[in-house]
């Protein structure tokens, strides 16, 4: 591989690590609710409107807002650049998507609506661990705009377990975002939908190469992250929200100091929720696992303002709204590592059904 | 094993045209097709410099210096990224590399490209 970056250094951005989190439920107070983008089929185990959920409006105060799920004039072309075997997408033509790839009209897809009370409390989901996450500010990493979303490519070294025998290799983590008055989460809890999400994506050591584990079981795994918004700023983002301005054209690249890639993550890697997806972009691979936190990250409004307005996408559209809607569940179950279920009783329920990467 | 493989360096006099090619080989089809695409350089005792790229979304975007002579393009159906250089001058001169970035980088082992008379 070629060494290094020339005249595309990032300036240093100091500050403490700390991510500052909150808890999801029903404390949480919300940006804004939306109705479910793709509502499962009738079959008996998912209505198709979670904000039927009264208990769960009424203690949130929440109002039954139904808003557009990704808006046809957001960003890109969509998928009709066929010359050349093009494979452009965007969210704003996800029903092109499978056009694109097959696999994105696949049953196990991924982002899902985290109905509570639907999930299933598994004791053998155990505490994630990371390791080598608190990266030193040399060598530098790429941050990039690809038109889609801002992107850090991690070193190698960043290590993480899922359980014993489940070991993964961080690649990149990005961000998905929405507006300055719509949020924009890929994934929703009860319905709701958070300003933003952070994903971190790992692949199986199992697998020397990303290509060989594309649609394996187990073979790519992501650990997600909600953002959302309070009075501190976030010293740990600010690292990487310092720099958007310099990466603001789509196909910017610069380099930026190392930084703590755990800080960007809830400190609580114990509470979280579990199940088999996909990648939530074309090629939408499935076989994906996904480790969604409890915890929020807390991001001021100034730096979620500073996410959502500060990079551009193709046809000199801003870079906004970049989420997939929620996707059926298809007699998926959640599994979660804590009692998640409102009505939960104190023993674990539906322990059968936990599964571990590869199965 | 994903291999990208570069060819269409070699010698050409200042003002010349050449036109680079990167085949992406091995079992990287669904990869290639999804990936920000680029092409890199590196002069003699320089660093690496992005040359062009083709995002994942379909923009492009050149370095100033090749602005208006260089145009980048992909055929995903032939899994291959080209160059196509106008109007060579000698600090043109370096290896190019190759860049497939979809979650994890792939490079290829350059090409060597000498503007000279």
């Known amino acids: 591989q070629p060494q290094g970056l020339s005249g595309m250094q990032g300036e240093p951005s100091l500050g403490d690590s700390s991510s500052g989190e909150d808890e999801l439920g029903v404390d949480v107070l919300p940006s804004e609710e939306d109705a479910p983008e793709e509502a499962d089929p009738p079959d008996g185990e998912d209505p198709p409107e979670v904000n039927s959920e009264d208990r769960m409006e009424e203690s949130l105060g929440l109002e039954d807002l139904s808003t557009p799920e990704a808006p046809e004039h957001s960003q890109g072309s969509h998928g009709d650049e066929k010359g050349g075997g093009h494979s452009h997408w965007s969210y704003g033509g996800t029903l092109l998507w499978p056009q694109v790839s097959p696999a994105c009209a696949g049953r196990f897809q991924s982002p899902v609506d985290i109905r509570l009370e639907r999930t299933a409390f598994c004791r053998t989901l155990q505490p994630l661990e990371l390791l080598g996450y608190e990266l030193q500010p040399l060598p530098e990493l790429s941050l990039s705009n690809n038109g889609h979303t801002v992107q850090l490519t991690l070193p190698p070294g960043l290590k993480m377990a899922l359980g014993p025998g489940q070991e993964y290799r961080a690649l990149q983590l990005h961000l998905h975002w929405g507006t300055s008055d719509h949020p924009g989460s890929e994934h929703t809890v009860n319905g709701h939908r958070f300003p933003a999400e952070i994903h971190v994506v790992h692949l199986s050591t199992a697998f020397s190469e990303l290509h060989e584990a594309l649609g394996r079981p187990g073979g790519l795994a992501v650990l997600a992250a909600f953002l959302q918004e309070s009075p501190e700023e976030n010293s740990a983002y600010e690292q990487l929200l310092s720099h958007l301005e310099e990466i603001s054209e789509e196909g910017s690249k610069i380099e930026i100091p190392g930084l703590d890639v755990s800080a960007l993550l809830p400190s609580d890697l114990s509470r979280y929720y579990r199940y088999e997806g996909s990648l939530t972009t074309p090629p939408c691979s499935q076989g994906v696992i996904w480790t969604v936190f409890n915890e929020t990250v807390k991001l001021s409004a100034k730096q979620l303002h500073t996410l959502s307005v500060s990079l551009w996408g193709p046809r000199d559209s801003r870079l906004q709204l970049n989420f997939r809607a929620t996707q059926p569940l298809n007699g998926r179950t959640i599994e979660a590592s804590f009692p998640a279920a409102e009505d939960s009783s104190p023993e674990p329920v539906h322990v059968n059904s936990c599964f571990t990467a590869g199965d | 094993q994903v291999q990208l493989v570069e060819s269409g360096g070699g010698l050409v006099q200042p003002g010349g045209s050449l036109r680079l090619s990167c085949s992406a080989s091995?079992?990287?089809?669904?990869?290639?097709?999804?990936?920000?695409v680029a092409w890199y350089r590196q002069a003699p005792g320089k660093g690496l410099e992005l040359v062009s790229v083709?995002?994942?979304?379909?923009?492009?975007k050149y370095s100033d210096s090749v602005k208006g002579r260089f145009t980048i393009s992909r055929d995903n159906s032939k899994n291959t990224l080209y160059l196509q250089m106008n109007s060579l001058r000698a600090e043109d001169t370096a290896v190019y590399y190759c860049?497939?970035?979809?979650?994890?980088?792939?490079w290829g082992q350059g090409t060597l490209v000498t503007v000279s008379s």
């Open positions: 860049n497939v970035d979809y979650l994890q980088d792939y």
């Open positions: 091995g079992n990287s089809a669904n990869i290639f097709s999804f990936a920000s």
């Open positions: 083709i995002t994942s979304a379909g923009g492009t």
